[in-house]
Interface confidence: low
């Protein structure tokens, strides 16, 4: 209640909104044919929708997304020497979220 | 660079630090013996360590944690009528993070 403090605070729902998450940049995003390289940085921040909705029939989903290209280092190892190249990875940021009804497919009759 | 418009910005590492994450409050945290109830709210925000470290032999780990009790509603369904009770769930918040060496067990010889 307003002005009251209990030992265990009331749990507050994690509302459906964008939050900062960590996205791992996997090597196959850059080169599917070659495994003999490293990527720097190995992870970046992205904005993603998360949280809960009022009931179980609705889910927190992105209602607006934006693609964001970023430049990473592709570090190839050639004869034990690092060769630094540039590569572009396209990240997906969520800009807005909404609680959306889960459409379950009707059974075919 | 200053004055130029690059299509792709340099990727910035997601440093090892606490970020807000969503924690799903599962029913078995409250009552393992009875499944005939719902929990409200179904999810809450917690602080958790995430991000990357400088090399693959180190991992982002919590160096300081704090337990936080919160009060939730246990909604029991009795004769199709909802009965509202209170329950306490203890959440784990990460207060500080550090890049920690991964200790791999030595093979037994």
């Amino acid at each position: 209640s307003l002005g009251s403090l209990a030992a265990a605070e009331p749990a507050v729902i994690a509302e459906c909104k964008t939050r900062t998450e960590v996205f791992q940049i996997s090597r196959n995003l850059i080169d599917r044919t070659n495994a003999n390289f490293l990527v720097w940085p190995p992870c970046v921040e992205v904005q993603r929708c998360s949280g809960c909705c009022n009931n179980r029939n609705v889910q927190c989903r992105a209602s607006q997304v934006q693609m964001r290209p970023v430049q990473v280092r592709k570090i190839e190892i050639v004869r034990k020497k690092p060769i630094f190249k540039k590569a572009t990875v396209t990240l997906e940021d969520h800009l807005a979220c909404k609680c959306e009804t889960i459409v379950t497919p009707r059974p075919v009759t | 660079s200053l004055g130029s418009l690059a299509a792709a910005e340099p990727a910035v590492i997601a440093e090892c630090k606490t970020r807000t994450e969503v924690f799903q409050i599962s029913r078995n945290l409250i009552d393992r013996t009875n499944a005939n109830f719902l929990v409200w709210p179904p999810c809450v925000e917690v602080q958790r360590c995430s991000g990357c470290c400088n090399n693959r032999n180190v991992q982002c780990r919590a160096s300081q944690v704090q337990m936080r009790p919160v009060q939730v509603r246990k909604i029991e369904i009795v004769r199709k009528k909802p009965i509202f009770k209170k329950a306490t769930v203890t959440l784990e918040d990460h207060l500080a993070c550090k890049c920690e060496t991964i200790v791999t067990p030595r093979p037994v010889t």
Partner: antibody, heavy 120, light 107 residues
């Protein structure tokens, strides 16, 4: 200063309808659960209904279930109680009250009340 | 439903007296018990929540105790403005229920 001001009470015939309103100010209305509590003349307090902060969850006393509907408009900082199929036993002063968070289920701040009289 | 029984239903006391009002729940409600004060023609006012926590702005002469089924509201030194009706309320489960009230009158 927290203020809750009820309106909409009055004399109504049995079987009739009435809509009560509660205007809230002095606190972040959209963050708090809200309730209606009533008090029959010279009687004790009786819980009527509670609504969650976002309005998605509503709860009713058995005595009013199916006849009364609680609702809110967070943009207008207002709480409502739609009362249908009114009976003589619904005659009471109706108070709106702030009910805290998800797990409080108490009545922190109250309005001054509005009198509903059901009589032919 | 949880029944709340208050006793006494009324009492007479003098300014400066120590007054105790009891509230009994029909089943265990842990510490989910709240106390309210109501003066004639006025809205109730929250005094104590969670059995023993004093609501902000309430004088420290009011205190609450108890857990489970038996609870007590104590006024350590009755003041003229304390003559009113007091209600207990359980917030353990719905339907939310109040005690019948205790009227504190001037002796």
């Amino acid at each position: 200063e927290v203020q809750l001001v009820e309106s909409g009470g009055g004399l109504v015939q049995p079987g009739g309808s009435l809509r009560l309103s509660c205007a809230a100010s002095g606190f972040t209305f959209s963050s708090y659960w809200m309730s209606w509590v009533r008090q029959a003349p010279e009687k004790g307090l009786e819980w009527v209904s509670t609504i969650s902060d976002g309005g998605g969850l509503t709860y009713y006393a058995d005595s009013v279930k199916g006849r009364f509907t609680i609702s809110r408009d967070n943009a207008k900082n207002s709480l409502y109680l739609q009362m249908n199929s009114l009976r003589a036993e619904d005659t009471a002063v109706y108070y709106c009250a702030e009910s805290g968070g998800y797990t409080d289920w108490l009545f922190g701040y109250w309005g001054q009340g509005t009198l509903v009289t059901v009589s032919s | 439903d949880i029944q709340m029984t208050q006793s006494p239903s009324s009492l007479s006391a003098s300014v400066g007296d120590r007054v105790a009002i009891t509230c009994r729940a029909s089943q265990s409600i842990s510490n989910y018990l709240n106390w309210y004060q109501q003066k004639p023609g006025k809205a109730p006012k929250l005094l104590i929540y969670a059995a023993s926590s004093l609501q902000s702005g309430v004088p420290s002469r009011f205190s609450g105790s108890g857990s489970g089924t038996d609870f007590t509201l104590t006024i350590s030194s009755l003041q003229p403005e304390d003559f009113a009706t007091y209600y207990c309320q359980q917030s353990y489960s719905t339907p939310l229920t109040f005690g019948g009230g205790t009227k504190v009158e001037i002796k």
